[in-house]
């Protein structure tokens, strides 16, 4: 009984859980789970039957493809749910979707550790702030990616005069958004206005 | 967890009804049925009914057919089995059973511990 | 209503055997059966579904198999704790019925 999906989306947009096959034939009973135990809805040839849970309000089942469609998703519906189905034969048969609900993230604020002019050469060291976050880090400057082992919130590098870059960027990334915050330099080694 | 907490032993008289409960706990009461299954001395398993927490949906075996009433009570999740006109072949264990679904299915995964009920005179 | 008849009415075993309880429905009945335990003075405990799905928590010792009308009951290695009456119930159609019962005692 595996048929384990996984899908991510982002916080407070709706959501539709459902399986790529078409369900079984003339099925007797319909169930949608979530953490394995707590039934959300089921639907049993006569009707669709909404159950005590955080859920309901905001879900529908559709009974033809046992579809299940969650308004204004939030980060705490993150779990595996389970759509079970009982057959006419008397035989169940489980789908699983492990969802995975994310905020998305806020504009980083890109903070200035230390600017060196060390012999017409640059020390830079920038730290990328977001609070408590796991997402991907890219720094650009001039728009042009740094190379990816420099790619971690804080960006620390000592640059030559000819690969000075007025504005360095950092992108902040999850699976489902992205935002940058940006600062700039005014040649050689001295911050300019933001 | 979950667990089905029935009622204790009764002794009645012939002619006499029962009302046995049995309070559920550790899962959505409303998500699942309810059999009510009995067992006499030394004898084999003898499905009685079944009633959907839900909306009160009964099918009560034939040979039970106007002597026995299921009800539930879903603000204190508990399912009750009333047996009337009570004779001396009554005398049994009655259990309560968790169906897997909202509707009837047919099987049972948790099963309350039992209440005897003894008719004699 | 469907009858069901199970066979043996009574075994007798070693820890470490293996053993099969037959049931056989008196109409096809698909894959709607389970099979139960019950030790003395206690409330029975479910074990298969739909014929051969395992409940929750049941160990993997126990094994369900059939479909239509014959349907078997396996215990791949006597435990102490199994010996007990097993029960097959239909659940195809109301009123749901159950096997006399099998009686698993010590050799």
């Known amino acids: 009984q595996g048929h384990l999906v996984h899908m991510t989306v982002v916080s407070g947009s709706n959501v539709t859980l459902n399986i790529s096959e078409s369900l079984p034939e003339n099925y007797k009973q319909l169930t949608w789970f979530y953490t394995f135990d707590q039934k959300i809805v089921e639907w049993d040839s006569r009707k669709s039957k909404y159950f005590e849970s955080k859920f309901k309000g905001r879900v529908r089942l559709d009974p033809q493809s046992g579809a299940l469609y969650i308004s204004k998703v939030q980060k705490e519906d993150n779990s595996t749910y389970i759509m079970r189905v009982l057959k006419k034969t008397g035989n169940e048969q489980e789908w699983k979707i492990k969802l995975q609900v994310l905020d998305p993230v806020p504009k980083p604020v890109i903070k200035i550790e230390k600017i060196e002019d060390m012999d017409d050469n640059c020390y830079l060291k920038l730290s990328c702030v977001i609070p408590g976050e796991s997402v991907n880090y890219t720094w650009y400057g001039d728009k042009r990616p740094f190379p990816k082992e420099l790619q971690n919130s804080v960006l620390e590098t000592t640059l030559m005069p000819h690969n000075y870059s007025r504005c360095y960027t950092c992108q902040v990334s999850n699976s489902v958004s992205s935002k940058n915050g940006t600062v700039c330099l005014s040649p050689p080694c001295t911050l300019a206005r933001s | 967890q979950v667990q089905l907490v029935q009622s204790g032993a009764e002794v009645k008289k012939p002619g006499a009804a029962v009302k046995v409960s049995c309070k559920a706990s550790?899962?959505?009461?409303?998500?699942?049925?309810i059999s009510w299954v009995r067992q006499a001395p030394g004898q084999g398993l003898e499905w009685m009914g079944w009633i959907s927490a839900y909306d009160g949906d009964t099918n009560n075996a034939q040979k039970f057919q106007g002597r026995v009433t299921m009800t539930t009570d879903t603000s204190s999740s508990t399912a009750y089995m009333e047996l009337r006109s009570l004779g001396s072949d009554d005398t049994a264990v009655y259990y309560c059973a968790r169906d897997r679904y909202s509707s009837s299915s047919g099987y049972f995964d948790y099963w309350g511990q039992g209440t005897l009920v003894t008719v004699s005179s | 209503d469907i009858q069901m008849t199970q066979s043996p009415s009574s075994v007798s075993a070693s820890v470490g055997d293996r053993v099969t309880i037959t049931c056989r429905a008196s109409?096809?009945?698909?894959?709607?059966l389970a099979w139960s335990q019950q030790k003395p003075g206690k409330a029975p405990k479910a074990l298969i579904y739909a014929a051969s799905s395992l409940q929750s928590g049941v160990p993997s010792r126990f094994s369900g198999s059939g479909s239509g009308t014959d349907f078997t009951l396996t215990i791949s290695s006597l435990q102490p704790e199994d010996f007990a009456t097993y029960y097959c119930?239909?659940?195809?159609?109301?009123?749901?019925?159950f096997g006399q019962g099998t009686k698993l005692e010590i050799k």
């Open positions: 109409q096809d009945i698909s894959s709607w």
């Open positions: 550790g899962y959505t009461f409303t998500a699942y049925g």
């Open positions: 119930q239909q659940a195809n159609s109301f009123p749901y019925t």
